[in-house]
């Protein structure tokens, strides 16, 4: 009875005491057909959901709250009481200490502290039965019954639905006798709910519905599984596609058997030459948690092709929770000679199946959608890598991705896929042992698919120098080396510390690479970050430039008249970023075609006029040429006296 | 390339949204109490209470029986008319607070928000598989019934709830009823009380046993009657009710209250109170 | 089979520009790169630029103010386009494939230019 | 930029005769190609990386060197042997070309 842990739940919104079943009876420790009070409770008045369910269902044994009472009139009767003891129910009566009796006046020898009424001091503690698994409902209306040995509480729900679900704790999930609406009002079911022979009255608005206690019937299970193990007083049998009781349906109820169900396979496709293994998903392939299967019950033909079962293996057996049913059957698939490329269908059927414990399988189940195909392979690149490997081979075809296995081969050793889709396979190139070109193959399902290629293994790429030191986003880089074009790309990569960005470059010549910076935002545009630009070529070793600053990208003013006065003989013209980036890239200021000697004195860019420079009635053009990028800042005038541009 | 089969939720293994249509009956008006009789003789019935107006009906749900219960005041009422003539008190709609079976006769006992919570005693008389009410009996003594000391006065207008226990030959009515204070001071009904329907079915026997909320703390202590049910030597009645007295009235908490169901007395009255919680 | 076709003007006149495609079959542009070099009347040859498999261009830093090459891939055509002739720029000018070894495997037929008046 | 010198602008050599042209670079390169070019022709590769002979070259021809110095031989000259011969560095930017070495028969 002590408090426990957890969220309190401390309105009760509706009760029913019922006696229990053999298993919810083994579950609270007490003996079956013992009365049990069942309380359904609330957050607060209004009901409104805090965190967790909108209601719990707690059950308080008959048993144990007198039990528990009994000992509360002993704790305050029978000496030694404890100190300070209330009797309670201060609203009723005088407030006292046990052992007295309301009021003040202490007992006289006739009367006896048993004789008055009690607060018992400790409280009744227990957790919701159903885990929280009532989530969203609001239940307005209960009722407990038992039946063979469940225990079924049926509930009233705020929005007009009849909840008969198996009283039990153990499961993370609710056993459901059926939930239904009892009509389109939605109105909330009413507290009250009465018993008639086998029939539940509960009201809602102004209508009385009567709910057979077995539910109202069985439509609801959409599996034949689901069906036949739905319990006994519920009635249920199959009916050859739906769920139902023996009046619904009497040509055709049985509860025997079960067909076995195919939901889904995989793969959807195999190679006509070559194996594939196929998985079956479904319901009702075994019933036996294992996996085992016993011998020749299981027939697999996928078109004219048989599916030979194979062991399931035991290190892939996962624990299925009871809330999620599934079964998967795994087949090896080697297609015959007389097989035609093409869609066709996947069979599975079950014979000679031992009983389990509700039924037994048995039957036929077909399903749509396999194809053979033939995978072609039409191209390979690049054909060439470094001798380190890890060179990206894309392989171009069709059909590549059908069937459960494929592999490239360099040279006889797998190439690591790494992508797979129809018409494209990546892998990364393993290791060769010396420069030489060797054979390169595609296998699916064991079997070579047709064509000749070689891949050639180079000299690793050696990286001996980056420069310069420093540069902006998709400023150029000088990479030097070796054998630079035995990778199909080099990669630069800028991390900071926290994070990388990467740019490919483009191959180009044998030791020497102009590559481009990679994306990378410098948020101070005063400032830079320094970290460490790499080089690298496929699985080959990379270089690595310490201490690379990466600057803001300068940025050009919009073109406009640049106007000389008299006696001026250099333009002076803002470039904001331009001075930070003139040790990290190549910049080239020109007026009229002539290169002038630029300098920086902080944003602003001094160009002293060429001395030939001959300003024409239209000016000359200004010119900054930045990493290769040019702009023309606008033209170069000399006014006149009157302020109309003339030449000098 | 390990593919698993997707799971497959267990609901998919159901539909919740399959129309399932039961047996019903429309009362006319929103119902306000019911309840079931079966006799010994195959013999059963629905008593449905909607304002104004008692139903019964047959196994079936369909109507047998249809008797009107108020308003109080109206030339209509079937129940007020065994009350005899005169006005017995303010008029106004009946409301049933109180439906409930006395198994020793058998008998229905209805009692309603109007006529200070009297109740109203209805024979059954088995015809075939239906039921049908004799003439209801008014069970109110005029000349037993005081404002201040009213025995017969047992419906609240706030909720009352009823179990009736046999003991020996006698019924004896466990009443648990939700007051304030406006309700305390019109006929005095009581919170939890016991009492002895007399053998005349004139009502109930005076001096009967009760606990009433003290008038000081009327105002602030409202104490909601949920459930109450007989099991083995014991009636309970099923309460939320403010955690105390002094604090808070609206930090509430479930009690169980637990009386004797083999002695009328309030003496061993006890309560506990019950926790429930949720532990993710 | 690789083949680089030439086309373009054979008089251009001084300080106009020069425009001269080079079609290409047998490989694909995404995947080589494509130089031009030229060859001045009886002299040696010289390297004007490249337009690579990815659209990065390099060009002759003594030209590269008056250069540019351009190609449209899926047309198999490479562009070279110089302005300002002037009469030391009559030359041959060829287009070459290049094998990223280091060395151009296979060359067009050359397009002759005579920058005169 | 990377300058490859050849020496010899002309030469002349007689049939059966060892002919030897040299191309220096002033900077270190770690191939040399060279180039056939035949009057009102475009210049075929000839040998490449070094020492490697280019498809349909005749075995006479052969190529060595490393570094600064590398040198083209015939081990025995023959008439279609005319033409200009020129060495090349496609391995760093600026592509660079020699002036070439004019072979004639003697």
């Known amino acids: 009875g002590a408090p426990e842990g957890g969220q309190p739940y401390p309105v009760l919104r509706v009760a029913h005491s019922a006696p229990v079943g053999a298993q919810l009876a083994t579950e609270l420790s007490i003996a079956e057909g013992q009365e049990v009070l069942f309380g359904v409770f609330v957050t607060g008045k209004d009901g409104g959901p805090g965190v967790g369910p909108n209601s719990v269902v707690c059950a308080f044994p008959i048993d144990l709250l007198d039990t528990l009472i009994d000992e509360g009139v002993e704790r305050c009767c029978e000496s030694p009481v404890h100190p300070g003891l209330r009797r309670g129910l201060d609203f009723f009566q005088s407030p006292s200490f046990c052992p007295n009796p309301p009021g003040l006046e202490a007992l006289s020898p006739n009367t006896s502290c048993r004789h008055f009424p009690l607060l018992v001091s400790s409280s009744f503690s227990r957790v919701d039965l159903f885990n929280g698994l009532l989530g969203p409902v609001q239940v307005t209306a209960l009722y407990v019954t038992r039946l063979d040995n469940v225990t079924v509480a049926h509930m009233g729900t705020m929005d007009g639905r009849i909840l008969q679900v198996e009283l039990v704790r153990s499961l993370n999930y609710l056993l459901y006798v059926s939930n239904f609406s009892l009509g389109d009002s939605g109105q909330p079911v009413q507290r009250d709910v009465s018993r008639l022979g086998d029939h539940l009255l509960f009201a809602s608005g102004d209508q009385v519905f009567q709910v057979p206690i077995q539910g109202p019937g069985c439509r609801h299970f959409l599996t034949c599984g689901r069906c036949l193990r739905a319990w006994h007083f519920m009635g249920c049998g199959w009916c050859g596609n739906m769920c139902g009781q023996q009046k619904e349906c009497p040509g055709s109820w049985q509860q025997d058997h079960c067909p076995p169900k195919l939901t889904e396979f995989h793969p959807h496709s195999g190679p006509l030459r070559g194996s594939t293994r196929l998985t079956l998903c479904g319901s009702n392939f075994y019933l036996h948690p294992s996996g085992l299967v016993p011998e020749g019950t299981h027939q697999v033909t996928v078109g004219q092709s048989p599916c030979r079962p194979l062991p399931k293996d035991s290190s892939k057996l996962r624990p299925v929770p009871r809330k999620d049913f599934v079964e998967e059957f795994e087949c090896e698939l080697e297609p015959l000679g007389t097989q035609a490329v093409g869609p066709t269908n996947v069979s599975l059927t079950v014979t000679n199946m031992p009983p389990g414990k509700h039924f037994r399988v048995d039957g036929t189940s077909v399903l749509r959608g396999f194809s053979f195909m033939e995978p072609v392979l039409i191209a390979v690149q690049p054909l060439f890598g470094p001798r380190a490997g890890g060179t990206c081979l894309t392989l171009e075809g069709q059909s590549l991705s059908v069937g459960t296995s494929r592999a490239v081969l360099v040279n006889g050793t797998e190439c690591l896929l790494a992508r797979v889709s129809e018409g494209q396979l990546l892998c990364a190139t393993p290791p060769g042992a010396t420069v030489a070109s060797v054979p390169l193959s595609l296998q699916v399902g064991g079997a070579q698919v047709p064509g000749s290629w070689t891949f050639q293994y180079r000299e690793d790429p050696v990286v001996l120098s980056i420069s310069p030191n420093c540069g902006y986003i998709n400023s150029h880089i000088t990479i030097c080396g070796q054998h630079l074009t035995s990778a199909w790309h080099l990669v630069l990569s800028f991390h900071d510390g926290l994070r990388a960005v990467e740019s490919r470059c483009e191959r180009q010549l044998p030791e020497q690479q102009l590559c481009r910076l990679p994306e990378y935002v410098v948020r101070d545009p005063q400032g830079w970050v320094a970290g460490n630009l790499s080089a690298r070529g496929d699985g080959a070793a990379g270089f690595t430039l310490p201490g690379f600053r990466f600057l803001p990208p300068p940025h050009p003013p919009s073109a406009n008249l640049v106007p000389l006065k008299p006696e001026e003989h250099a333009i002076k013209f803002e470039y904001i970023g331009l001075g930070a980036v003139a040790d990290c890239v190549g910049i080239n200021v020109t007026v009229g075609g002539e290169s002038c000697q630029h300098e920086f004195r902080g944003d602003m860019v001094v160009c002293p006029l060429p001395p030939s420079l001959q300003l024409g009635q239209d000016g000359a053009p200004l010119q900054v040429c930045v990493d290769g990028e040019c702009h023309i800042l606008g033209r170069v005038v000399r006014p006149g006296p009157d302020g109309v541009p003339q030449s000098t | 390339e390990d593919w698993q089969c997707p799971r497959t939720p267990y609901a998919a293994s159901r539909d919740f949204d399959v129309k399932y249509v039961v047996p019903s009956f429309s009362a006319g008006g929103l119902v306000q109490a019911m309840v079931t009789y079966e006799g010994d003789r195959n013999e059963s019935a629905v008593f449905v209470a909607i304002r104004n107006r008692l139903h019964v009906l047959g196994p079936d749900l369909k109507s047998v029986q249809s008797l009107a219960t108020g308003p109080a005041g109206d030339p209509g009422c079937q129940t007020c008319a065994a009350c005899g003539p005169g006005p017995h008190g303010p008029p106004g709609d009946t409301d049933t607070k109180v439906l409930v079976l006395d198994p020793a006769l058998p008998a229905l006992v209805s009692c309603g928000s109007s006529l200070q919570g009297r109740c109203f005693l209805h024979d059954l008389e088995p015809q075939g598989t239906a039921v049908h009410l004799a003439a209801p009996a008014c069970l109110f003594s005029a000349h037993h019934n005081r404002p201040d000391d009213c025995p017969d006065c047992v419906a609240s207008p706030l909720g009352t709830r009823v179990t009736v226990v046999e003991q020996g030959q006698a019924s004896y009515f466990y009443v648990a009823s939700s007051l304030d204070a406006a309700v305390a001071a019109s006929f005095s009904p009581r919170s939890v009380s016991i009492r002895r329907l007399k053998a005349d079915a004139s009502g109930f026997a005076p001096g009967f046993v009760a606990l009433s909320v003290l008038p000081k703390h009327l105002v602030s202590y409202s104490i909601e009657y949920v459930h109450s049910f007989h099991t083995g030597a014991f009636v309970y009645f099923l309460t939320v009710q403010p955690a105390s007295v002094t604090d808070d009235p609206s930090a509430l908490h479930t009690r169980l209250a637990r009386l004797s169901a083999t002695e009328p007395e309030l003496g061993d009255y006890r309560e506990l109170v019950l926790d429930c919680r949720f532990a993710p | 089979q690789v083949k680089l076709q030439q086309s373009g003007p054979g008089l251009v006149a001084p300080s106009q520009s020069l425009s001269i495609t080079c079609t290409v079959s047998?490989?694909?542009?995404?995947?080589?790169?494509v130089h031009w070099v030229r060859q001045p009347p009886g002299k040696g040859l010289e390297w004007l630029g490249v337009?690579?498999?990815?659209?990065?261009?390099n060009y002759n830093s003594a030209l590269m103010s008056r250069l540019s090459i351009s190609k449209d891939n899926s047309k198999s055509q490479v562009f070279l386009k110089m302005n300002s002739l002037q009469t030391d720029d009559t030359a041959m000018y060829y287009c070459a494939s290049y094998d990223y070894d280091g060395y151009f495997d296979v060359w067009g037929a050359g397009t002759t230019v005579t920058v005169s008046s | 930029d990377i300058v490859l010198t050849q020496t010899t602008a002309i030469m002349s050599a007689s049939p059966g005769e060892k002919v030897t042209m040299t191309c220096s670079a002033s900077?270190?390169?770690?191939?040399i190609h060279w180039y056939q070019q035949k009057s009102s022709t475009s210049p075929k590769l000839w040998i490449y990386d070094t020492s490697k002979l280019a498809s349909g070259v005749p075995g006479r021809f052969s190529g060595s060197g490393s570094g600064n110095s590398y040198s083209l031989t015939i081990s025995s000259m023959e008439a279609e042997d005319v033409a200009t011969y020129y060495c090349f560095q496609g391995n760093k930017y600026p592509l660079t070309f020699g002036a070439g070495t004019k072979l004639e028969l003697k």
């Open positions: 047998g490989f694909s542009l995404t995947s080589y790169g």
């Open positions: 337009i690579w498999a990815g659209g990065t261009t």
């Open positions: 900077s270190s390169v770690s191939y």
